[in-house]
Amino acid sequence: HTAAQDNCTCPTNKMTVCSPDGPGGRCQCRALGSGMAVDCSTLTSKCLLLKARMSAPKNARTLVRPSEHALVDNDGLYDPDCDPEGRFKARQCNQTSVCWCVNSVGVRRTDKGDLSLRCDELVRTHHILIDLRHRPTAGAFNHSDLDAELRRLFRERYRLHPKFVAAVHYEQPTIQIELRQNTSQKAAGDVDIGDAAYYFERDIKGESLFQGRGGLDLRVRGEPLQVERTLIYYLDEIPPKFSMKRLTA
């Protein structure tokens, strides 16, 4: 498939099985877990990556205040249902027939229910706030250098068009990266901010999804930027629907 290497691997997704059985003997790569063909010239969707991960053997003040509707992924890993394009299906259920609705990044946005639960549409996550705390350094990073380096990272490594990196905020030791992408802004083939954020999250955790590349080596003017904590907030185009019981818990 596109950009699968001569040695038949997928540079943008190591959780694939590749073989030269595409048209004309071209290399074709399929995601583990789902068996879906993936485009190796771009990032693989988070849904297919989560599915692959679940199928893999188990091993060991200028700052933004997240809105009251911001979601954090507290539920952790699950084996998702993906549609034919690799996107999350709006309704997800587990093996015990417990169901819930998710947004476009696969984060639960309703209370859990049973099989009668309806999720009418996949609600788009249009604003992602990545909140990082870096390890102590001799001094604060220069804000404009940090801004430029993080924008370069999202453009070059995660293939995200620069206009989707809305802002980089910094108050030592907290860094916030704001990604924004409305439906009207996303061209066909554009990397989704949810997928870019997921690749970044895995990189930060030292679990790079890229094939054969070294892990993420983030440096600002030669000074290593080492992250010790990450929190990601997701804002949907339509606010989530949780019961008051959860909100007061």
Epitope: S41, R159, H161, P162, A166, A167, N182, K186, A187
Partner: antibody, heavy 118, light 111 residues
Framework: EVQLQQSGPELVKPGASVKMSCKAS????????MNWVKQSHGKSLEWIGY????????GYNQKFKDKATLTVDKSSSTAYMELRSLTSDDSAVYYC???????????WGQGTSVTVSS | DVVMTQTPLSLPVSLGDQASISCRSS???????????LHWFLQKPGQSPKLLIY???NRFSGVPDRFSGSGSGTDFTLKINRVEAEDLGIYFC????????FGGGTKLEIK
């Protein structure tokens, strides 16, 4: 001096494909997104898509997703656009245009005229 | 897609007069980063479009200061003070806040 030199005019038959080129000079080719724009005779402009030469990432106008394929050759600082299954509606002038940091198309090629006729 | 509507379609002017072209978008062009990615181009007969103004009001290099852009949200204006013969042609507005689109064009011609 920034320059975008496009390939010459094309006369092609319906159903055929055409591949045009846009050679960049005067700037670091891999640092800028390259856009392609269609202008039908006496009409306005339509954005087709962009490509980022450094890694080949693309974005397309949904309307042209199945019509156009954008590629680059970094070694020659050249961007390419292939148009397939041509019909008379594809007869137009096609421009490549560099995108600046304000996301505006600041330098344009001279255009490649495509005429689809049997 | 975001629709860009330009008025007038044709603008006859006398040399030395001021010309004003309007561009209206079907959605706000304010980006999540606070900027507004609305641009103006001039296309002379037989030539490719040339960038005049980017992000509403910034003149591109080499563009004379008789060209000025203004506006916000969904309503934008290009003004040309003291029109010269070399200014004649078709003016297009364009937005890149959303998937890029162009206005239909305004033909500036001699009265």
């Amino acid at each position: 001096e920034v320059q975008l030199q496009q390939s010459g005019p094309e006369l092609v038959k319906p159903g055929a494909s055409v591949k045009m080129s846009c050679k960049a000079s005067g700037f670091t080719f891999t640092d800028y997104y390259m856009n392609w724009v269609k202008q039908s005779h006496g009409k306005s402009l339509e954005w087709i898509g962009y490509i980022y030469p450094n890694h080949g990432g693309t974005g397309y106008n949904q309307k042209f997703k199945d019509k156009a394929t954008l590629t680059v050759d970094k070694s020659s600082s050249t961007a390419y656009m292939e148009l397939r299954s041509l019909t008379s509606d594809d007869s137009a002038v096609y421009y490549c245009a560099r995108e600046n940091y304000g996301y505006a198309m600041d330098y344009w090629g001279q255009g490649t005229s495509v005429t689809v006729s049997s | 897609d975001v629709v860009m509507t330009q008025t007038p379609l044709s603008l006859p002017v006398s040399l030395g007069d001021q010309a004003s072209i309007s561009c209206r978008s079907s959605q706000s062009l304010v980006h999540g980063d606070g900027n507004t990615y609305l641009h103006w181009f001039l296309q002379k007969p037989g030539q490719s479009p040339k960038l005049l103004i980017y992000t509403v009001s910034n003149r591109f290099s080499g563009v004379p200061d008789r060209f000025s852009g203004s506006g916000s949200g969904t309503d934008f204006t290009l003004k040309i003070n003291r029109v010269e013969a070399e200014d004649l042609g078709i003016y297009f507005c364009s937005q890149t806040t959303h998937v890029p689109t162009f206005g239909g064009g305004t033909k500036l011609e001699i009265k």
